[in-house]
Each structure stands twice: as C-alpha cells, then as structure tokens.
C-alpha cells in the first residue's frame, strides 16, 4: 500500500464536533482524543489532516511566505496551497523559497519555455536545440475529492 | 508519562525461539498501533511487524514473514513478538513501539529501551 | 522498497555552529501537500527519539534549534547552532509506500 492508494476528503462532511474512532483512527479533518475515546474536529483555518489517523493533534497550516501567493486556503482537510509569484519559481533542489526568472536567454540561444511558478525561462541552443536549464519539475499531485479509507498494511 | 518495558531477550541457538513481550501505561493502548523494530549490532533500524488496534491488521517485512507472529492483549495493554526460526541475522536489540498512524502506519512516536536477543551456537 | 540515502555518513561541527544531514530517497515521497518523511535522534545505549514528522513538524519536547525541510525525495535535517547533547546518530524514516524504511544513519560529533 502506498500513500498514492489513500485519497483524502477535499472537506470532511459536516459532523459533530466529536464522533467515535474506528478501529483506533480517526477521519480526515479530526485527530483523537488522548483517552482515544473520540474523533475532534481540527480548526478551520489554522490547523488540518488529510488523512485516517490516530494523531493527537492536527497538523498546523502552512502560512505562505513573503514572495508567494495563495492559491487555496487551508481547510480542516487540507493544507494551504502556496505559490510563488510571477516572475519567480520554485527550483525542486531547493524548494524551500522563490527565485526570480531570468530575464532573458544567453547569446545563442533561444527561448522555447516561459517563467512558470515551477520553472525558469527554457533556453535551447539556435543550432543544436539542446536545452540550457534541466528539465521542469513536476507540479505537485493533484488532490481528488474521493474520501479516504483507513488502509493499512496487509499480511 | 508513555512507558513501554521490553522482556523475553537472551541467547538462543540457531532455529530456536523466543517470545518477547512489551508492558504499555501511559497511553490508551486499545486505540494505537504498535510494532517491534529492531537494531542489529552497530547497524540501522528496520521495522520487523507492526499490528493495528484490535489486531486486525498485521505486516511483515519479507525479511521475517512467516517466521514472526506479533499479537496483542489489550485487555493486558500488552504487545507480543512471537519469533520462531531464529537465524544469526536476527542478533539485534528489538525495541517495542507506538507506531502513529497517518494514512498509513507512519512514524514512530514511543519507543521503549529495547531487548537483546542474540542467536548464536 | 524506496531506499534512503542519507549523507554524509559521518559530520564534525563545532559547538554553536550549523549542522546539516541531507536524506535522498529514490523515489517521492510526497501526496497531497504531505511529504512522509521522519527522522530519529539515537544517542549511545538508548533508543531513537522522534524529533520530527512529515518533514517539518518538531515533535512537542525536541528544541527548536532542529528543523527539517525538504520535498518530493530531497530532505534536510539542520541543528542550526550544535549543542554537546546533540552527538548522536541520525535517521530519516519514510512512510509514504510500505514497507517502511529507514536510512543508513549520519554520525554527528563535536569538531
């Protein structure tokens, strides 16, 4: 089983404040009791689970960063979605801030790709066509709305 | 205060067995997920099984299928490794833990001081 | 099995400055804005400790002067100003595909 195989709920359906485990976990949106007697909701807005669980806590929302925009806010069942502003991306070897687009290409080369949140400018070379930067990361997984199942794995 | 105590280590030949069990407090064990990891000598850490809250659901890596049976007594808030079949490459200090659950099993969050068991002739 | 490549094996910092032990795992770990990785401080004659989960989530207890970053199959666990207390080996542990794994474990000692 992988996490690939567990889809979490978009927003949780509306439920009480506490409802009980199922077999010890909890449902995406909630996190449980200490005395693990029952599910409680996470707060809107500042804390979120994606996933069946038995955490003590919801984890806290991300807060986007200077230079970043938000592309959706946090809800009980998921995180806020950052992205960097135009003009700037987000390099997959240092994800951690935006760095701003080249302007433009070297000498000899040709533009073939625009800025993007994910990545710089792309520059081939005139004659070859052999690409300047690395290839451009991958947006990040899609979320889907189907609700998650408490999976585990199997003998 | 999580408490989780390790026993059932010691010295058995090759193709012996050995129970281990571990006493929880401090935590509602009923509602967790736990595992046994284990430490070979001077080596890393792998996960040897791992058993939901009513015992329902089990893994094992293929390293110890088979071989192993974990179980649990929540009415005793206690966890077991049943190990039959011993080989050398099972010399390790196997430690009980509360395994968090997060989609799947996730980290582990509790662990006790661990038990040498040592296979050897 | 993702396998977990931690490096450098070994790493001598000198009290007060920054430690940094980099976790690669041969394939993503990342779903749903989540990235499944752990890590572990083990000191002599214990067991590990959780410091943190999901990449960047400081367990209740451990010093804020550890944190951790990183996506997709690139993680860092930084100790931004080392302390004596902070020798001890260092895990990672993903959780996004069983079975679960650990990485081989990075040294840290005082320079």
């Known amino acids: 089983i992988t996490q690939q195989d567990l889809a979490p709920q978009q927003r949780a359906a509306p439920q009480q404040k506490r409802s009980s485990p199922s077999e010890g976990l909890c449902p995406p949106g909630h996190h449980i009791s200490e005395d693990g007697r029952d599910c409680i909701s996470c707060k809107y807005g500042q804390d979120y689970s994606t996933h069946w669980n038995d955490l003590l806590f919801c984890l806290r929302c991300t807060r986007c960063d200077s230079g970043e925009v938000e592309l959706s806010p946090c809800t009980t069942t998921r995180n806020t979605v950052c992205q960097c502003e135009e003009g700037t991306f987000r390099e997959e070897d240092s994800p951690e801030m935006c760095r701003k687009c080249r302007t433009g290409c070297p000498r000899g080369m040709v533009k073939v790709g625009d800025c993007t949140p994910w990545s710089d400018i792309e520059c081939v070379h005139k004659e070859s066509g052999t690409k300047h930067s690395g290839e451009v990361p991958a947006v990040e997984e899609t979320v889907t709305s189907s609700p998650g199942t408490p999976a585990s794995p199997c003998s | 205060e999580v408490q989780l105590v390790e026993s059932g280590g010691g010295l058995v030949q090759p193709g012996g067995s050995l129970r281990l069990s571990c006493a929880a407090s401090?935590?509602?064990?009923?509602?967790?997920?736990m595992s046994w990891v284990r430490q070979a000598p001077g080596k890393g850490l792998e996960l040897v099984a791992a058993?939901?809250?009513?015992?329902?659901?089990?893994h094992y890596p293929d390293t110890v299928k088979g071989r192993f049976t974990i179980s649990r007594d929540n009415a005793k808030n206690s966890l077991y490794l049943q190990m039959n079949s011993l080989r050398a490459e099972d010399t390790a200090v196997y430690y009980c833990t509360r395994l968090t659950y997060y989609g799947n099993p996730a980290w582990f969050a509790y662990w006790g001081q661990g038990t040498l068991v040592t296979v050897s002739s | 099995n993702i396998v977990l490549t931690q490096s450098p094996d070994s790493l001598a910092v000198s009290l007060g400055e920054r430690a940094t032990i980099n976790c690669r795992a041969s394939?993503?770990?990342?779903?749903?804005?989540?990235?499944?990785m752990h890590w572990y401080q083990q000191k002599p004659g214990q067991p590990p400790k959780l410091l943190i989960y999901l990449s960047s989530n400081l367990e209740s207890g451990v010093p804020d002067r550890f944190s951790g970053s990183g996506s997709r199959t690139d993680f860092t666990l930084t100790i931004s100003s080392l302390q004596a207390e902070d020798v001890a080996v260092y895990y990672c542990?993903?959780?996004?595909?069983?079975?679960?794994?650990f990485g081989g474990g990075t040294k840290v000692e005082i320079k």
């Open positions: 058993i939901n809250s009513n015992g329902g659901r089990i």
């Open positions: 542990q993903q959780s996004y595909e069983d079975p679960l794994t």
């Open positions: 394939e993503s770990v990342d779903i749903y804005g989540n990235s499944f």
């Open positions: 401090g935590l509602p064990f009923n509602s967790y997920y």
